[in-house]
C-alpha cells in the first residue's frame, strides 16, 4: 500500500509518457490522476514501467474501478494484465473478442495460468456459448483448450465451432469428452459427401458408438491404425472380422502388430478363431471350433 | 414394429415448466439419436434438439437455448424434454423422433411419436 | 437467420407427377430431406441426402437438389399422397424445415 503524500511541484503528470519511469512509486501515486490512466492505458505498454512501477498504477485503477474496469481500460491492459488476481477479472465483463485475443497475446508462450483460465472462463459464459470465432482463438493459443473442459461444458458447444477444431486439439481428450464431441462433430459435418466427411470426421471417432462404426465399414474409408487404436473398447467389440476388414482396408494387416493391444486384443477374444482365420495374419486367440458363445449380458438381463 | 410412445397432453400457465417423456418399444433404443420437433396449432414443423445415444451429448436449436433441457435415460429406454419459462406461443405438439437409418452421416427421423399438445394458458 | 421457401400449394390429377420445391441459399451445398404429413398424423421421412428413398417408401416418391434449389417429385400421384410436405436441411448449428406445401390430389 502506498502511503498518500501531496504531488511534488511540477511533477503532476499531463499524460501517460516516458517520463514516468523515472518517478518513485509515491511519485506515481501522488502525480498521476487515475482518469487519465484510464484514457491512456494503450501507452502503458510501451513504456518499461518495473513491476513495482505496475503495482501502483493498478491499484490506482483498483481505486478508480472498485466494482471492476470496464471493458475499455481491460482491452488495453498489456502486461498489466499480468497483474490481475482471479478475483479482479472475475469482476470483469468481457464481451469482445478483440478484449480476448489482446490479453491472450501477453500471456503467449506460457501454460494457461489461473488469470487467464478465469478470463477465458468469463468470457465464455458471457457469450452463452463456445462460438466457432471464441473456440478458433482459444485453440490457436491453448490447442489442449478443448480438452481441458468437462463433459458437461463440452455439452454447450455449438456444432459449428468444430470446424474450428484441429487434429491436435484433440490429443489429450479423454473418451469422456470425444463421447460429447463427436455427435456435434457428426452434425456439424453432416452436408460432406462420403471421402470429405470422413477426413473431417476422423479426429473424433473415439466418441463413435458402434453402429457408425459399422456404417463407415460400408464406405471404402480405410480407416488407418491409429485411429482405429482410438476408438472405444466396447464399440469396436460387437464388430465382425468381415466389418472390420471393410474399415480398415488395405490397413487390416497393421492388425497383427497390434494384437496384444487394445482395442484389438479384446476384440480378437470374441471372434471366432475361423474369422480371424480368414484375415490370413496369423491372429491368435479366438473363439475355438464348436465352443458356444453365450452372450451374459443378455443373459443378466434375462436373470 | 418399434414405437415411440410419449406421454399424455398437458396444460401449463405462463412462466412454468413442462416435461415431456418419449419411452421406445424394443431393445434397441439405446443406441439411436432422438430429435424433438415441435408444431403449433396450423404451423409447420420447428426443430428443438437433439440428444445423443448415450445422452451426454445434447445440441439444442439457439432458439431455445437456456430453455430446454433434453435428458435420457437408458435404464429405462426414456427420452425427456423439459421446456421452461413457457409462454403462450409455446402452445404446440411436441414431437420426439427417432435417428434408425444407418447412413454414417444421417439424422433422417425414421420413427416418431404421437405427438404430444401442451398447452399454455392463464 | 436461413430459410427455406416453399409454394404454399400444388394441385394435381391423380395418376399425373407433381412436384414441389423448396428453395434456399446455396441448398445445393447441404442435403436435403423430405416429410410427409396427414392431418391429425406424424410426419413420416419420404426422402433424406437429396434423392435416397428409406424402405417402405414406394419409388414414386424421388427428389433432387442443385443450385438454390430442391424438388420432391410424386410420380404417378394417388389419392393417398395428399399431404402437407416439409423439406429439411441443416444450417450451421439447426435444422431449418421449409414453410411446408399442401399437396391436393384432384
Known amino acids: 500500500e502506498v502511503e498518500k503524500t501531496a504531488c511534488p511541484s511540477g511533477k503532476k503528470a499531463r499524460e501517460i509518457d516516458e517520463s514516468l519511469i523515472f518517478y518513485k512509486k509515491w511519485e506515481l501515486e501522488a502525480c498521476v490522476d487515475a482518469a487519465l490512466l484510464a484514457t491512456q492505458m494503450d501507452r502503458v505498454n510501451a513504456i518499461p514501467f518495473t513491476y513495482e512501477q505496475l503495482d501502483v498504477l493498478k491499484h490506482k485503477l483498483d481505486e478508480l474501478y472498485p466494482q471492476g474496469y470496464p471493458e475499455s481500460v481491460i482491452q488495453h491492459l498489456g502486461y498489466l494484465f499480468l497483474k490481475m488476481s482471479p478475483e479482479d477479472i472475475r469482476k470483469w465483463n468481457v464481451t469482445s473478442l478483440e478484449t480476448l485475443k489482446a490479453l491472450l497475446e501477453v500471456n503467449k508462450g506460457h501454460e494457461m495460468s489461473p488469470q487467464v483460465a478465469t478470463l477465458i472462463d468469463r468470457f465464455v459464459k458471457g457469450r452463452g456459448q463456445l462460438d466457432k470465432d471464441t473456440l478458433d482463438t482459444l485453440t490457436a493459443f491453448y490447442p489442449g483448450y478443448l480438452c481441458s473442459l468437462s463433459p458437461e461444458e463440452l455439452s454447450s458447444v455449438p456444432p459449428s465451432s468444430i470446424w474450428a477444431v484441429r487434429p491436435q486439439d484433440l490429443d489429450t481428450c479423454d473418451p469422456r469428452q470425444l463421447d460429447v464431441l463427436y455427435p456435434k462433430a457428426r452434425l456439424a459435418f453432416q452436408n460432406m459427401n462420403g471421402s470429405e466427411y470422413f477426413v473431417k470426421i476422423q479426429s473424433f471417432l473415439g466418441g463413435a458408438p458402434t453402429e457408425d462404426l459399422k456404417a463407415l465399414s460400408q464406405q471404402n474409408v480405410s480407416m488407418d491404425l491409429a485411429t482405429f487404436m482410438k476408438l472405444r473398447t466396447d464399440a469396436v467389440l460387437p464388430l465382425t472380422v468381415a466389418e472390420v476388414q471393410k474399415l480398415l482396408g488395405p490397413h487390416v494387416e497393421g492388425l497383427k502388430a497390434e494384437e496384444r493391444h487394445r482395442p484389438v486384443r479384446d476384440w480378437i477374444l470374441r471372434q471366432r478363431q475361423d474369422d480371424l482365420d480368414t484375415l490370413g495374419l496369423g491372429l491368435q486367440g479366438g473363439i475355438p471350433n464348436g465352443y458356444l458363445v453365450l452372450d451374459l449380458s443378455m443373459q443378466e438381463a434375462l436373470s | 414394429e418399434v414405437q415411440l410412445v410419449q406421454s399424455g397432453a398437458e396444460v401449463k400457465k405462463p412462466g412454468a415448466s413442462v416435461k415431456v417423456s418419449c419411452k421406445a418399444s424394443?431393445?434397441?433404443?439405446?443406441?439411436?439419436?432422438v430429435q424433438w420437433v415441435r408444431q403449433a396449432p396450423g404451423q409447420g414443423l420447428e426443430w428443438m434438439g437433439i440428444?445423443?445415444?448415450?445422452?451426454?451429448?445434447?445440441t439444442y436449436a439457439q432458439k431455445f437455448q437456456g430453455r430446454v433441457t433434453m435428458t435420457r435415460d437408458t435404464s429405462t429406454s426414456t427420452v425427456y424434454m423439459e421446456l421452461s419459462s413457457l409462454r403462450s406461443e409455446d402452445t404446440a405438439v411436441y414431437y420426439c423422433a427417432e435417428t434408425r437409418g444407418s447412413g454414417f452421416n444421417y439424422f433422417g427421423m425414421d420413427v416418431w411419436g404421437q405427438g404430444t399438445l401442451v398447452t399454455v394458458s392463464s | 437467420s436461413y430459410e427455406l421457401t416453399q409454394p404454399p400449394s400444388v394441385s394435381v390429377s391423380p395418376g399425373q407427377t407433381a412436384s414441389i420445391t423448396c428453395s434456399g441459399d446455396?441448398?445445393?451445398?447441404?442435403?436435403a430431406s423430405w416429410y410427409q404429413q396427414k392431418p391429425g398424423q406424424s410426419p413420416v421421412l419420404v426422402i433424406y441426402q437429396d434423392n435416397r428413398r428409406p424402405s417402405g417408401i414406394p419409388e414414386r416418391f424421388s427428389g433432387s437438389n442443385s443450385g438454390n434449389t430442391a424438388t420432391l417429385t410424386i410420380s404417378g400421384t394417388q389419392a393417398m399422397d395428399e399431404a402437407d410436405y416439409y423439406c429439411?436441411?441443416?444450417?450451421?448449428?439447426?435444422?431449418?424445415f421449409g414453410t411446408g406445401t399442401k399437396v391436393t390430389v384432384l
Open positions: 424394443g431393445d434397441t433404443f439405446n443406441r439411436y439419436y
Open positions: 440428444i445423443n445415444p448415450s445422452g451426454v451429448s445434447t
Open positions: 429439411q436441411a441443416w444450417d450451421s448449428d439447426t435444422y431449418v
Open positions: 446455396k441448398l445445393g451445398d447441404k442435403y
